[in-house]
Structures are given as structure tokens and as C-alpha cells.
Amino acid sequence: MAVTACQGLGFVVSLIGIAGIIAATCMDQWSTQDLYNNPVTAVFNYQGLWRSCVRESSGFTECRGYFTLLGLPAMLQAVRALMIVGIVLGAIGLLVSIFALKCIRIGSMEDSAKANMTLTSGIMFIVSGLCAIAGVSVFANMLVTNFWMSTANMYTGMGGMVQTVQTRYTFGAALFVGWVAGGLTLIGGVMMCIACRGLAPEETNYKAVSYHASGHSVAYKPGGFKASTGFGSNTKNKKIYDGGARTEDEVQSYPSKHDYV
């Protein structure tokens, strides 16, 4: 029961985490600027992984996808890659974990198979969470190192000049969403791995055979020694005594009135 609860909770926590990672990746507010008082109007500027936006004091808001012509920080591509890898791994992990859930019966799937699938999905969630945390942390580090934009002027060939607007970069909401979501996915993955240990059956390297006296009907079958050594016709470990030797399963399936404890 505890295993089922741990597995189910791990799945739900990971699901919420991956939904959060997707949300963070799509959000525009990865970095925000302190209100920059342009002489024309107060401008609030914020950037995401895919586009940047501006909101004027009048309420007008506009977003545009990044123009590669204007150049992008090299780290932005790395962050994009980390977040996408995190989403893909998380999505695959969710798919695997659905089939691994103990409360869901699919055909005659054994517990050992479910345990393996639970472990696989758990590892995927852990890596997914780490990717998201790494992506968000790389971005945050990029903001910290560029806390105050350099205002050094760069002169163009036409006698004009271009400069970056002096502005203070602050962490956007998406960073916090990403950190929390990555953490949840990581926790969910750990819970799945813990649940896997409870699901895995204790396997023995041999099939137990119990011998029972069954009255006077014991008959010796030649080939018994051959069976035990693996030679001869009896290689499938069939019963070598008519009523005397049974596997554990057979004892439970066909109890005899002559069986002794």
C-alpha cells in the first residue's frame, strides 16, 4: 500500500513539475528591467527565451521574437537546449510511469517489469529536473554577471553610434517557476526510485521443491538422477516422483489429503 502511495505521489509531483517546466520555458518574464524612464514614456521591458516584450506606461504591450541580426547571448541557446531536453525527458518519463503505476493493470505485466519501468521513469524525472534547474541557474548567472549593462559606445561606419540602454536586470517570474518546477520533478523522480525498491520482488536463483510423503503411492522413476545433473531426457525438471515431489506452486494449487505438515 505504501509503495503504491509513494509511486502515485511521485507521479503526481513529477507531473506538476514537468507542467511547471513547460510553463517556465514558454514564459516571457525570464528577466525584467527596472522601470526605465525614457523621456517619451515610462518603459517596462522584459525578456523570455524566445522573445522580448515592452510595456508602456499607457498600458500598450508588444512582444517580438528575437532578431538574430541584433545578436543573442550564446548562453541563451544553451538554456533553451537544457529546458527542451528537460521537457522531452520528462514527457517520456511520464509516459513510462503511467504504464508502471501499480494501480493500473495492463495485461499480465509482472511486478519486476513495473519495477524496472518505475526506476526508468524515476531516473528520467531526476535528469529532467536537473536540466531545468541547470537551465534556470545558467540564465540567472547570466543576469547576475550583466547586472548593470555596459554603456560603452560602439561607433558604426556611418558616423552614428549604438549603445545598450543602461538598465538594471532583475530575475523574472519564470526563473522562480523553473526552479520550483525543476525541484518538484527531481523530488518526484526520487520518490519513483524509492517506490521501485518496494515493487521489485525478491528473486531466488532456484525453484523451491518440497517433498511430501503421500502414503503408499510413492513410485521411483528412473531418470531422477539424470534430471538433477541436467543430462538425459528429463531436462525440464519434471516431477520425478508421482505424488511425492511437487513445486511450491503445485502444492498450493492441488493440496492432497495425504499431505503432512
Epitope: 528591467q33 526605465y36 525614457n38 517619451v40 514614456t41 518603459v43 521591458n45 525578456q47 522573445r51 522580448s52 516584450c53 515592452v54 508602456e56 506606461s57 499607457s58 500598450f60 508588444e62 512582444c63 517580438r64 521574437g65 528575437y66 532578431f67 541580426l69 541584433l70 545578436g71 543573442l72 547571448p73 541563451l76 550583466n146 549593462m149 552614428g160 553610434m161 549604438v162 549603445q163 545598450t164 540602454v165 538598465t167
Partner: nanobody
């Protein structure tokens, strides 16, 4: 690289009119804010007038009622119609374009300036 080229400057008598024009070239990206600044000899560069994509327009107190700014988004140009010019309007006028969207770091582009002299 976005380049701004100003034109229309010259010598004009007090009370006269001039129309300054600024054309953006080099990159087909319309800016979010376009403005005019001026710098008189021995003085700091000051804001004259500007407008945004959202339609916000602002003028410096010293030019209100005399100057009119307009913008053609399709051509990526901004014009400044200057009427009732005064000698104190004498300065080098600079065109400025600021891009906030479509770039990770907000950018401010400047033209090389055009001279406006108001003298009798």
C-alpha cells in the same frame, strides 16, 4: 547594423520653419521608440520630442505647440516639423531609435546629427 541618417537641417530666420527627417536603414527592424534630441554648443544633449509604437507622444516644454513629430512605420522614418523657430533652437539635432522588442539587450541607436541654425 541599424543606421540612422538625418536630413533637412540648415539656416533659417527666426519665426521660420524646417522639417527634419530621419531614416533608419541597414536592418529591417522597426524600433519601439523614436525620438529627436538636440545639443547646443557647450550644453548637454536634451530631449526634444519622441513617439512610441504604442502611440505615446511627448514634447519638451520648450518646444510644445511649435514642433510636431510624426512617424511612418512602413518606411521606418520619423519627421520633426519645426515651426516658429527661435534663436535658442540653434543646435545639432540627433535622431534616436530605441529597440526593446526582438533583442535580448535593449539598444539605443543614434544618428550623426544635422545642424539647425536660427539666425537673422
Amino acid at each position: 547594423q541599424l543606421q540612422l541618417v538625418e536630413s533637412g537641417g540648415g539656416l533659417v530666420q527666426p519665426g521660420g520653419s524646417l522639417r527634419l527627417s530621419c531614416a533608419a536603414s541597414g536592418v529591417d527592424i522597426s524600433s519601439d521608440v523614436m525620438a529627436w534630441y538636440r545639443q547646443a554648443p557647450g550644453k548637454q544633449r536634451e530631449f526634444v520630442s519622441g513617439l512610441t509604437r504604442g502611440g505615446s507622444i511627448n514634447y519638451a516644454d520648450s518646444v510644445k505647440g511649435r514642433f510636431t513629430i510624426s512617424r511612418d512605420f512602413a518606411k521606418n522614418t520619423v519627421d520633426l516639423q519645426m515651426n516658429s523657430l527661435k534663436p535658442e533652437d540653434t543646435a545639432v539635432y540627433y535622431c534616436n531609435a530605441e529597440i526593446y522588442t526582438g533583442t535580448f539587450y535593449p539598444r539605443s541607436y543614434w544618428g550623426q546629427g544635422t545642424q539647425v541654425t536660427v539666425s537673422s
